[in-house]
Amino acid sequence: APPDPLSQLPAPQHPKIRLYNAEQVLSWEPVALSNSTRPVVYQVQFKYTDSKWFTADIMSIGVNCTQITATECDFTAASPSAGFPMDFNVTLRLRAELGALHSAWVTMPWFQHYRNVTVGPPENIEVTPGEGSLIIRFSSPFDIADTSTAFFCYYVHYWEKGGIQQVKGPFRSNSISLDNLKPSRVYCLQVQAQLLWNKSNIFRVGHLSNISCYETMADASTELQQ
């Protein structure tokens, strides 16, 4: 086919999709034109496995990513539950436009959020010391609408200060009790989430939370003797 005479703009370079927790953000490097006073604008389109291409606009996906001067498109800007369904196979493409001119489309490799997401650490971690125990409560890295499709489980990495690290899990609950610890000792811990998706037998392991340390309570019988 002869080249399209209107396809004379350079294409956007190095597009990246950021999938962090519930975020879905496409970004790219700007197209720089030395001989134009008008700004270059960009258009983003998406498709699912067997669908046609859709322009990414308010009607189709809830955000406007057509004729934009910004060099990113945040599909989850409206709310964390917005954006593409997390178990869908999504392909994105992007081009630059200037008046009647446009670049070639740059098509990205397909993604599935659950397959490709980077999972952050559990949030809002609270630890309550007990007698020879620590009770740990936290919230999940992000909300999963349908927990029959995918769910989080959790691991606690813990160690007595100066001692050997251990791992406890996997737990389905957002509340974990570390028992059989020594009383009146300092234990350090990190919590880690793991995303399990029922359509795939591959998991996504999350980042570890920051290290935090706590002293278990004294044994009641020991306190009575003092």
Epitope: Y155, V167, K168, G169, P170, F171, R172, L196
Partner: nanobody
Framework: QVQLQESGGGLVQAGGSLRLSCAAS????????MAWYRQAPGKQRELVAT??????WYADSVEGRFTVSRNNAKNTMYLHMNSLKPEDTAVYYC??????NGQGTQVTVSS
């Protein structure tokens, strides 16, 4: 509390196979939830497989090579490791929420 004990590690050539066992002391213990993880010297602990009965999920690095099975009559969970690679060299541990961890079992894969 139920105690876990790993065994079955050893030295094996690249491409070879091993079967690791995770035995639970305690006649009533059933493995409905458990995981295998590994620790190589100087590296972060790495989750290898997670089991929530009846499903198992695997790390990208071992998917298609490692499988998990269990024998409830023997209170034992297994990690079948095929097509082993030098990068699989580590101490392997099993863990379950209601049990104490074991000492791990060393797997060394030579090239």
């Amino acid at each position: 509390q139920v105690q876990l004990q790993e065994s079955g590690g050893g030295l094996v050539q690249a491409g070879g196979s091993l079967r690791l066992s995770c035995a639970a002391s305690g006649s009533t213990f059933t493995f409905s939830t458990m995981a295998w993880y590994r620790q190589a010297p100087g590296k972060q602990r790495e989750l290898v497989a997670t089991f929530f009965s009846p499903s198992t999920w695997y790390a990208d690095s071992v998917e298609g090579r490692f499988t998990v099975s269990r024998n409830n009559a023997k209170n034992t969970m297994y990690l079948h490791m095929n097509s082993l690679k030098p990068e699989d060299t580590a101490v392997y541990y099993c863990t379950s929420p209601s049990a104490s961890n074991g000492q791990g079992t060393q797997v060394t894969v030579s090239s």
